[in-house]
């Protein structure tokens, strides 16, 4: 005897109580594949979570974090406070990046400025708390009399900005 349940499309479930009739998923539940014997309950985006995508009969809700926070982990399973660019989140809250480091995002850690001299280059644009240094051509690559936006300053690498 053919299993009638295999004919039930996504968004329905195979109702054993009704001779294997395909019944629509009840409110706040879904089935993302055909042939399901039950519908799964929808995820609730509450508390620190807000709804990014509403639950439908064929797909689960998707959560995001409330304003000022960002998702961590699979399926946005935790919310972490945003910081400003030029900061990182520590156990004591958002702290400015130390000299010689930068963070150009609202999340993550401060990273060291690029050391241009490791590639035989010079600093073209100085680093800040929010931005990495920009490396330019090496001093040897500059023809006599050539000028650059910022004179090479190997002694000040990796970059410098007034704090």
């Amino acid at each position: 005897l053919q299993d009638l349940c295999s004919n039930c499309p996504a968004g329905t479930f195979c109702d054993n109580n009704r001779s294997q009739i395909c019944s629509p998923c009840p409110p706040n539940s879904f089935s993302s594949a055909g042939g399901q014997r039950t519908c799964d309950i929808c995820r609730q985006c509450k508390g620190v979570f807000k709804t990014r995508k509403e639950c439908s009969s064929t797909s689960n809700a998707e959560c995001d974090c409330i304003s000022g926070y960002h998702c961590l982990g699979a399926e946005c399973s935790m919310c972490e406070q945003d910081c400003k660019q030029g900061q990182e989140l520590t156990k004591k809250g958002c702290k400015d990046c130390c000299f010689g480091t930068f963070n150009d995002q609202k999340r993550g850690i401060c990273r060291p400025w690029t050391n241009c001299s490791l590639d035989g280059k010079s600093v073209l644009v100085n680093g800040t708390k929010e931005r990495d240094v920009v490396c330019g051509p090496s001093p040897a690559d500059l023809s006599p009399g050539a000028s650059s936006a910022t004179p090479p300053a190997p002694a000040r690498e990796p970059g410098h900005s007034p704090q």
């Epitope: 309950i41 995820r43 620190v48 409330i66 926070y69 699979a74 399973s77």
Partner: antibody, heavy 115, light 107 residues
Framework: QVQLQQWGAGLLKPSETLSLTCAVY????????WSWIRQPPGKGLEWIGE???????DSNPSLKGRVTFSVDTSKNQFSLKLNSVTAADTAVYYC?????????WGQGTLVTVSS | EIVMTQSPATLSVSPGERATLSCRAS??????LAWYQQKPGQAPRLLIY???TRATGIPARFSGSGSGTEFTLTISSLQSEDFAVYYC?????????FGGGTKVEIK
């Protein structure tokens, strides 16, 4: 370092109101949700409910409306009141920060209900 | 509400051995599950969130796996400080619910 410090009366008589307060030190207060969880002696954990800085709340239906939450953003504090307590409410009560899971917890307050 | 069931209730393991703890949800919760460790007289401590992501400062010997209704916490090589009670918790749906706990004791 985020720290949660809680206090409140530890011994109550039946029908009285349980009152606990939790202060948050370090980190951000606004934006997060703040929860209460309890643990009867030798048993598991039960979520009581939560509140955010603007006073939005949610609570466990099992407590049948006996619970009230409040928040004082000027002091970075939030509070729990549970009225008409019985011996079944005897537990260690914890406050915690809700970031999805509970990532920071208070030290716990043992509340005993006895006549 | 979603009911969380943990097994076994007690697990006797020798130091250095592997411990495997199970948690089952009464309905699918995707990967929206956390694990906590609680020692006597202390508050629980978050170990794992999102079923498999270690919280800040948690040693690599703790790992979580699973999705849907079946979840596992594995402690690869038990240290003396790991003997404690472990709880799973779902935050997929409200009310938030915990499992009954698994006590990991010294064999």
């Amino acid at each position: 370092q985020v720290q949660l410090q809680q206090w409140g009366a530890g011994l109550l008589k039946p029908s009285e109101t349980l009152s606990l307060t939790c202060a948050v030190y370090g980190g951000s207060f606004s934006g997060y949700y703040w929860s209460w969880i309890r643990q009867p002696p030798g048993k598991g954990l039960e979520w009581i409910g939560e509140i955010n800085h603007s006073g939005s709340t949610d609570s466990n239906p099992s407590l049948k409306g006996r619970v009230t939450f409040s928040v004082d953003t000027s002091k970075n504090q939030f509070s729990l009141k549970l009225n008409s307590v019985t011996a079944a409410d005897t537990a260690v009560y914890y406050c915690a920060r809700l970031t999805g899971p509970f990532d920071y917890w208070g030290q716990g307050t043992l509340v005993t209900v006895s006549s | 509400e979603i009911v969380m069931t943990q097994s076994p209730a007690t697990l006797s393991v020798s130091p250095g051995e592997r411990a495997t703890l199970s948690c089952r949800a009464s309905q699918s919760i995707s990967s929206i599950l956390a694990w906590y460790q609680q020692k006597p007289g202390q508050a629980p401590r978050l170990l794992i969130y999102g079923a498999s992501t270690r919280a800040t400062g948690i040693p690599a010997r703790f790992s979580g796996s699973g999705s849907g209704t079946e979840f596992t916490l594995t402690i690869s090589s038990l240290q003396s400080e790991d003997f404690a009670v472990y709880y799973c918790q779902q935050y997929y749906n409200w009310p938030l619910t915990f499992g009954g706990g698994t006590k990991v004791e010294i064999k």
